[in-house]
Interface confidence: low
């Protein structure tokens, strides 16, 4: 058989026996030539090397370029190739010889003691156990122990090759300590050298790389990237790494075993790439890559290299920021830098420290945004090696729906004498303010919140028949009034305000607000009564520790059993969009008062008398009077407040002036407190007294002095008492000038 | 081979509890993830049980479902049912390609249908 | 946490020819996603993983490819099997347990 490319001027060298296989026995001689066109070298089984004492290579003596093997008596292990080559070219003859020993019809090894397979337990793979046999067509099987087991050859994956060995899947005898082949020729059995089985593993669960992502680095630094393997057991590893600049002087590489903890099913291989200096070209992709041989496993990072360090925002970072109150909002600083900035965050030029309601780091996160977050937000980014500062301001505005101011207060149900005029307001507050404050109505019977009626959460009415107010065909004459603008409590509210002309009819007003972000509604219930009538003796709020009574007074030939109840103490809460239930109609949350009964000639009139109100006895008082006739019950209900006692104080101060002869002097002082202080004022400690030239109005509270005179000058004191005490203020008031003489002196 | 059991309609609010049974496999060197499809709609990752019992959840399970297992077993406890839960519910065995934590899914259940309704 | 976007809800092709599906990450993550095939009343099941690797015992007309933020499964030599919605998702975990799992939203295949 020829071996290699026919060379142009080169024919093959030309063997004596031209077989490719050649049969002879054990103890005869082999004897084979070999003519070339240049020098020729012979290669033969068992000794690479050519330096095997037995075998004979000579010149031949006819011929140049002509070399003779020759074997005297040949033995089972000459078995194998024989090769005759050009040197230092790939051309070559080869035959392959049996030399049948039936005493040791297989080829022993370099090493005669025993051989070492290894395998790997992967179901798809298979191994050769390396029993080559001098005999090409023996019977042989595959003894394994232990636990002892034979394999005999099946067509098929298990299979005997003289010049190869035997084939058998791997997982077959990866139980197995050791393996031998066996052949039987007239009875007798013949065992070729021990095979040690060693399972090597090949699986490669994961190729991690650390650090795994975002690696930045400035020219000169270091760059060390670790590559993990984790592997089954015996496994061995090969590490390749591709980077983009291959010939970097700095480079070093350095592979090892990492220890597992003892009893672990898996192994550890680290390698390490370094290199000490990077320069731009080192930026690009970095790829480990391990390799068991059967498996490969890689794994990939980007590596970017700066010039130098720097710090800039990134072209995502908002300048707005738009929130609902309540919301969460999260403001990201955006920014390209080496190394990653300090990130620090100012509110109105004040730093921001992280609290639970409040996180100021690379992302400052407000958890529930409120009204009072609204402002300027400067974020200070400050690159750690060059101190290099960028800075950049966000404005978060923070929207709030519409809020009714008068749902906290609401009456579980007002009732309004019939015929009388009223006023119902919605007093909204919205950022930013409602662009429409809508009114409309139903009437009462329409929508009346029977207890047999289901509610639910979602359709919190049961009927939903809202009619604009401009329709008020049915119900009562209604005008809206232009939506004024007020400062309440230090808010710009909306307050929109409904005029039902004449109150005829009972119905269920609903104001709804809406803004950019959301809608808030306030529902009321104007429940018309012909019934008893409450009034307030005497007609206004008292103030705590005085005395107040409530008078329900009703006509005697239509109505009996007047009766005052309290509402509480705490009535039911009214959830948003829900209607205020009839009190007549709940009766349970209602506590029976004493009072007196007096009558006149056409009205009997129930008074209940409050000696020295208290906080306590503000809320909700309901008069309930029956239906001589029908027996039915008719509510009303009045709200009754209680001022809060205040001790005096003058609001803002009296200014020291100076003034010239003849000209006038106005100054006010203005005082509150419950009850109303009275005001009096003092010139150098002594009371003033009105005269010509000095006038107080509004209740003292404004004092003119007219053509101011010599001595008028001193120090003036306004001064507020009430039972809870007294307030003053001073002042200095010089009189410049000379006095003019006047006729009358 | 993986297979769900325990879907059935419930009212809103029901507690229920999914199962899925392995085979083939070992519970305690493989991760083990459910993942809901609704009708209609695409995947979504509930969450995932690791080798060595570890639990991960999305962040919109918020605590009403619970993740364990067994040696065969791995359970899905849902409370807090609503209508938006109604879905087909897929147990999958996770395959750890590169760290502990990431898995995709080489072996999925044929799903159990669960609908919540009233 | 990682959205993944499936830009085309559905795309047809006709028998034999080749059908080309994007899959796009809200950041970077390698090569860590794997795509499904999913036919009606069925379990998805594993076409490719770590982007590019094919999943065993499916066939070599279906490739992934991508690395980072942009990701493509192609299919060529479609045959009508190949009929179904397929899935993107990713197993990439930047620290936060809710990362892990994020698929996209599905791209119907139609066969013509």
């Known amino acids: 058989a020829s071996v290699g490319l026919p060379s142009v001027s080169l024919d093959l060298p030309r063997l004596s026996i031209q077989k490719d296989i050649l049969t002879i026995k054990a103890n005869t001689t082999l004897q084979i030539t070999c003519r070339g066109q240049r020098d020729l070298d012979w290669l033969w089984p068992n000794n690479q090397s050519g330096s095997e004492q037995r075998v004979e290579v000579t010149e031949c003596s006819d011929g140049l370029f002509c070399k003779t093997l020759t074997i005297p008596k040949v033995i089972g292990n000459d078995t194998g190739a024989y090769k005759c080559f050009y040197r230092e070219t790939d051309l070559a003859s080869v035959i392959y010889v049996y030399v049948q020993d039936y005493r040791s019809p297989f080829i022993a090894s370099v090493s005669d003691q025993h051989g070492v397979v290894y395998i790997t337990e992967n179901k798809n793979k298979t191994v050769v156990i390396p029993c080559l046999g001098s005999i090409s067509n023996l019977n042989v099987s595959l003894c394994a122990r232990y636990p002892e087991k034979r394999f005999v050859p099946d067509g098929n994956r298990i299979s005997w090759d003289s010049k190869k060995g035997f084939t058998i899947p791997s997982y077959m005898i990866s139980y197995a300590g050791m393996v031998f082949c066996e052949a039987k020729i007239n009875d007798e059995s013949y065992q070729s050298i021990m095979y040690i089985v060693v399972v090597v593993g090949y699986r490669i669960y994961d190729v991690v790389l650390s650090p795994s992502h975002g690696i930045e680095l400035s020219v000169g630094e270091k760059l060390v990237l670790n590559c993990t393997a984790r592997t089954e057991l015996n496994v061995g590893i090969d590490f390749n790494w591709e980077y983009p600049s291959s010939k970097h002087q700095h480079k070093k590489l350095v592979n090892r075993d990492l220890k597992t903890q003892s009893g672990s099913e898996m192994k550890k291989f680290l390698s390490t790439l370094t290199i000490d200096g990077v320069t731009r070209s080192d930026q690009g992709l970095y790829t480990c890559a391990a390799s068991s041989g059967l498996m490969t496993k890689k794994n990939s990072t980007f590596v970017r290299v700066h010039e130098k360090p720097f710090v800039a925002f990134g072209s995502g970072m908002e300048s707005l920021v738009e929130a609902t109150v309540g919301e969460r909002v999260r403001i990201p600083a955006k920014y390209l830098g080496y190394p990653p900035p300090e990130i620090k965050w100012y509110k109105n030029g004040i730093p921001l420290e992280s609290n639970h309601t409040i996180k100021a780091g690379h992302v400052l996160t407000i958890m529930e945004v409120s009204e009072r977050d609204t402002g300027n937000y400067t974020v200070i980014l400050t690159n750690p090696i060059s101190k290099e500062k960028q800075s950049h301001v966000v404005s978060l505005v923070v929207y709030v729906p519409p809020q009714i101011g008068e749902k906290s207060l609401i009456s579980p149900v007002d009732s309004y004498q019939y015929g009388t005029t009223q006023t119902l307001t919605c007093t909204v507050y919205a950022i930013p303010p409602p662009h429409h404050i809508h009114w409309y109505w139903q009437l009462e019977e329409e929508c009346a919140n029977e207890p047999s009626q289901a509610v639910s959460v979602t359709n919190p009415y049961p009927c939903e028949e809202w009619r604009s107010v401009e329709d008020f065909q049915g119900g009562n004459k209604i005008e809206v009034n232009k939506n004024q603008f007020a400062l309440i409590e230090g808010k710009n509210k909306t307050v929109s305000t409904l005029v039902i002309q004449a109150a005829n009819v009972s119905a269920l007003y609903k104001c709804e607000a809406v803004n950019k972000v959301g809608r808030g509604e306030r529902v009321i219930s104007f429940h018309v009564t012909r019934g008893p009538e409450i009034t307030l003796q005497p007609d206004m709020q008292p103030t705590e520790q005085e005395s107040v009574s409530l008078w329900c007074t009703a006509d005697r030939s239509t109505f009996e059993n007047l009766t005052w109840y309290k509402l509480g103490p705490q009535p039911l809460p009214i959830h948003v969009g829900e209607l205020p239930t009839p009190v007549c109609k709940n009766l349970d949350t209602l506590w029976k008062l004493n009072a007196t009964m007096f009558s006149n000639s056409t009205n009997d009139i129930l008074i209940m008398e409050l000696k020295n109100a208290s906080l306590q006895d503000q809320g909700d008082y309901v008069c309930l009077a029956q239906d001589r006739k029908t027996k039915k019950r008719h509510c009303v209900v009045r709200q009754l407040t209680v001022l809060e006692r205040v001790a005096p104080t003058i609001t803002g101060n009296l200014e020291n002036q100076t003034t010239s002869i003849g000209e006038s002097i106005e100054v006010s002082c203005t005082a509150s407190g419950n009850p109303p202080p009275q005001i009096m004022w003092f010139k150098d400690n002594e009371t003033l007294v009105e005269d010509s030239g000095i006038v107080l109005k509004d209740g003292n509270r404004n004092l003119t002095i007219r053509r101011v005179r010599k001595e008028d000058e001193g120090l003036y004191t306004c001064q507020a008492c009430s039972v809870l005490g007294c307030a003053k203020v001073e002042a200095f008031f010089i009189i410049e000038g000379a006095q003019e003489k006047t006729n009358l002196e | 081979s993986v297979e769900e059991s325990g879907g059935r309609l419930v009212t809103p609010g029901t507690p229920l509890t999914l199962t899925c049974t392995v085979s083939?496999?070992?519970?305690?060197?493989?991760?083990m993830s459910w993942v809901r499809q609704a009708p209609g709609e695409g995947l979504e990752w509930i969450g995932t049980?690791?080798?060595?019992?570890s639990t991960y959840y999305a962040t919109w399970v918020k605590g009403r479902f619970t993740i364990s297992k067994t040696s065969t077993t791995v359970d899905l406890k849902m409370t807090s049912l609503t209508a938006a839960d109604t879905a087909t519910y897929f147990c999958?065995?996770?395959?750890?390609?590169?760290?502990?934590?990431?898995?995709?899914?080489?072996?999925w259940g044929p799903g159990t249908l669960v609908t919540v309704s009233s | 946490a990682v959205v993944l976007t499936q830009t085309t809800s559905s795309v047809s092709a006709d028998v034999g020819g080749t059908v080309t599906i994007k899959c796009q990450a809200s950041?970077?993550?390698?090569?860590?996603l794997a795509w499904y095939q999913q036919k009606p009343g069925q379990p998805p099941k594993l076409l490719i993983y770590?982007?590019?690797d094919l999943a065993s015992g499916v066939p070599s007309r279906f490739s992934g490819s991508g690395f980072g933020t942009e990701f493509t499964l192609t299919i060529s030599d479609l045959e009508c099997a190949d009929a179904a919605t397929y899935h993107c998702?990713?197993?990439?975990?930047?620290?936060?347990?809710?990362?892990?799992?994020?698929f996209g939203g599905g791209t119907e295949v139609v066969v013509k």
């Open positions: 049980i690791s080798s060595s019992g």
């Open positions: 770590s982007a590019s």
């Open positions: 083939g496999f070992s519970l305690s060197s493989n991760a």
């Open positions: 950041e970077n993550i390698y090569s860590l």
């Open positions: 999958a065995r996770g395959d750890d390609d590169v760290s502990d934590y990431f898995y995709y899914f080489p072996i």
């Open positions: 998702q990713s197993y990439y975990y930047s620290g936060s347990s809710a990362d892990t799992g994020a």
